[in-house]
Each structure stands twice: as structure tokens, then as C-alpha cells.
């Protein structure tokens, strides 16, 4: 049984050019988290393997650089970048943790970060 | 250059156990991630296990109960046992290196491959 | 395990002609695929990762395409020495698994 829950930044804003951490947490279970994959839509942003450590998609090399921790910070940031994040939690023997970001980014200086939130786990297996 | 070399048996009696060697010049194994890959005759090939630049390990699920891979740095080697063979166990056996920070699980260096019968 | 389906198993075309190979992965990878390239009597070698970039020395002919759960590796116009299997992997999660191969033969 999955007991465990995964806490996001939940939603966040960000100015045009500047530069936001995603980060994500898992927690309320004893599961070894195997892999962590950064991902946008069909996009794979980084993968987090906990033997090999980071790689970031090349597509996005110039752009987003590891951590911290689990999380991932996006640099040089445009209003294209706004829309979902997920932090998809690799581990054994529970299965998938997927959490998920939402990021505005502004034209404008008015940019705040959204409050912490806790959402419901989602899984599925391999 | 990077350069592997599989060496080993070409011949393992069945319920014993498999063992090869693969050495590495041209590039440190205490960098980057070191595999075992193998391809039964007429079959897909099949992700072994790693064993990472810190010595850590990974074995695929289906394998995990007889595969032990491990590495001797002072050679510059690394080596593959698998326990209680069977002619499922027929391959040839590629060893491999993995650069993950830049190309995530895609293998990028291979060894030349060895065969490995397993019959009576 | 995430099954890598490839089609065509082989696939005649002619020097010059394009080549297109499929892979289907059961469930979405996003972009974190492989295609390499096996001739007789040699080991794999690597042709494209994360879906369509080219690894170093990859001749242009050869394009990777797609993402989630169909994939594409092209060859725009076959050589004779493009004959070979070509396998795709991918590397989302652990174990990371392989297709089939698809045999490329000349007309």
C-alpha cells in the first residue's frame, strides 16, 4: 500500500528573465526513492537518479540546472514557460509519486510565491 | 578513447555460476556508470545492471536474485556472476559504459561482446 | 517493465530512399529515448539520444523524432553502409528496456 504524500511549492509566480526553484518532497513513507524526473507536458526536463546523479535534457541545458536537493531551478525564464510542472518520485517498493507545480510567469514586478500546499498522491505502476 | 573488453568462459555448465570480466582503458571507472548488457540469440537485448562510479549497484528486477556485479579499481575492471544458469542464460554479453549526465541511460561506449553457451 | 515495440521488423528500400523505423513504448517516456545502430558481427553503437539529438560523429541523414509513446528514427537517404538492426531503448525508469530491432536491408 502506498502511504506516502509528495508537498510542492504548489503554485508559483515568477518575473519574465528571472529565475524560480521547483521543489518537491516526499514524505510518510519508508519507500528508497530510486529516480526523480522533472517533467513539462511530454517534456523531460532533468531525471535525479540516486546512484548517477543528475542529467538534464539537452534541450533545456542552457536553462535549468540541478537543484537544489531534488528540486530544479529555471533560469532566463519567458512567459512560454508558464504551465504545468510534475516531479514524478521513482521508488521502491511503493511505485510512482507524482507531484505537481503550477508556474505563472509575469511580464511585471507584481511576481509572489505561492504558499506551500500538500496535494493528493497520485501512482502507477511500471 | 574508451575501450572495454569482455573476457570470460564461452562455455558455463547449467546450475553454475557465469563469470566475466570486463577491462577498461582509457577512462577511470570511478567516473560515469559501468553496465552489463546482453542479447539471447534472436531476442531483444536485455538492461543486466550497473554499477555506478561509487561503487554502488543496480541489478534489473527480473535478474536481481542471481546477478552480482562489482569492480576492482586498482585493475581498472569490473565483473559480472550469474548464479544458477540456465540455457535462458545463452547471450552474448556486452559490457558498456553510460555517461549519464550527458546522455542520461544511453549507452555510449560498448565492448566487442562475448558469447556465452550454457550446456552440458 | 516499459515494452518497447518496434515496426517494421525489416524494412527493403532502396540506396537514396528514406528509411523510417517506429517505436512504440507502453506507457510515456516523455523524451527519454535511444536508437542505436548494430552491423553484423559488431556491438550496438549509439545513434540518437533523449529522442532526437544526434551522438557525436552521427552522420545528419539520421533524425530522431517524437515524444510520450511513438518515436521515429529516419534515415533521409540510405547508404550502403546504414545496412544494420536498429534498436531503440528507453531510459525514463529503471530497467531500462529495449525494442525488437528493425533489420535495414537495401532493394
Known amino acids: 500500500m502506498m502511504t506516502g504524500t509528495i508537498e510542492t511549492t504548489g503554485n508559483i509566480s515568477a518575473e519574465k528573465g528571472g529565475s524560480i526553484i521547483l521543489q518537491c518532497h516526499l514524505s510518510s513513507t519508508t519507500a528508497q526513492v530510486t529516480q526523480v524526473n522533472w517533467e513539462q507536458q511530454d517534456q523531460l526536463l532533468a531525471i535525479c537518479n540516486a546512484d548517477l546523479g543528475w542529467h538534464i535534457s539537452p534541450s533545456f541545458k542552457d536553462r535549468v540546472a540541478p537543484g537544489p536537493g531534488l528540486g530544479l531551478t529555471l533560469q532566463s525564464l519567458t512567459v512560454n514557460d508558464t504551465g504545468e510542472y510534475f516531479c514524478i518520485y521513482h521508488t521502491y517498493p511503493d511505485g510512482t509519486y507524482t507531484g505537481r507545480i503550477f508556474l505563472e510567469v509575469l511580464e511585471s514586478s507584481v511576481a509572489e510565491h505561492g504558499a506551500r500546499f500538500q496535494i493528493p498522491h497520485h501512482h502507477h505502476h511500471h | 578513447e574508451v575501450q572495454l573488453q569482455e573476457s570470460g568462459p564461452g562455455l558455463v555448465k547449467p546450475s553454475e555460476t557465469l563469470s566475466l570480466t570486463c577491462a577498461v582503458s582509457g577512462y577511470s571507472i570511478t567516473s560515469d556508470s559501468w553496465n552489463w548488457i546482453r542479447q539471447p540469440p534472436g531476442k531483444k537485448l536485455e538492461y543486466i545492471g550497473y554499477i555506478s562510479y561509487s561503487g554502488n549497484t543496480y541489478y534489473n528486477p527480473s535478474l536481481k536474485s542471481r546477478v552480482t556485479i562489482s569492480r576492482d579499481t586498482s585493475k581498472n575492471q569490473f565483473s559480472l556472476k550469474l548464479s544458477s544458469v540456465t540455457a535462458a542464460d545463452t547471450a552474448v554479453y556486452y559490457c558498456a559504459r553510460l555517461d549519464f549526465s550527458n546522455y542520461g541511460g544511453a549507452v555510449d561506449y560498448w565492448g566487442q561482446g562475448t558469447t556465452v553457451t550454457v550446456s552440458s | 517493465d516499459i515494452v518497447m515495440t518496434q515496426s517494421p521488423d525489416s524494412l527493403a528500400v532502396s540506396l537514396g530512399e528514406r528509411a523510417t523505423i517506429n517505436c512504440k513504448a507502453s506507457?510515456?517516456?516523455?523524451?527519454?529515448v535511444a536508437w542505436y545502430q548494430q552491423k553484423p558481427g559488431q556491438s550496438p553503437k549509439l545513434m540518437i539520444y533523449?529522442?532526437?539529438y544526434r551522438y557525436t560523429g552521427v552522420p545528419d541523414r539520421f533524425s530522431g523524432s517524437g515524444s510520450g509513446t511513438d518515436f521515429t528514427l529516419t534515415i533521409s537517404s540510405l547508404q550502403a553502409e546504414d545496412v544494420a538492426v536498429y534498436y531503440c531503448q528507453q531510459y525514463y525508469t529503471t530497467p531500462w528496456t529495449f525494442g525488437g530491432g528493425t533489420k535495414v536491408e537495401i532493394k
Open positions: 506507457q510515456n517516456v516523455r523524451t527519454a
Open positions: 533523449s529522442a532526437s
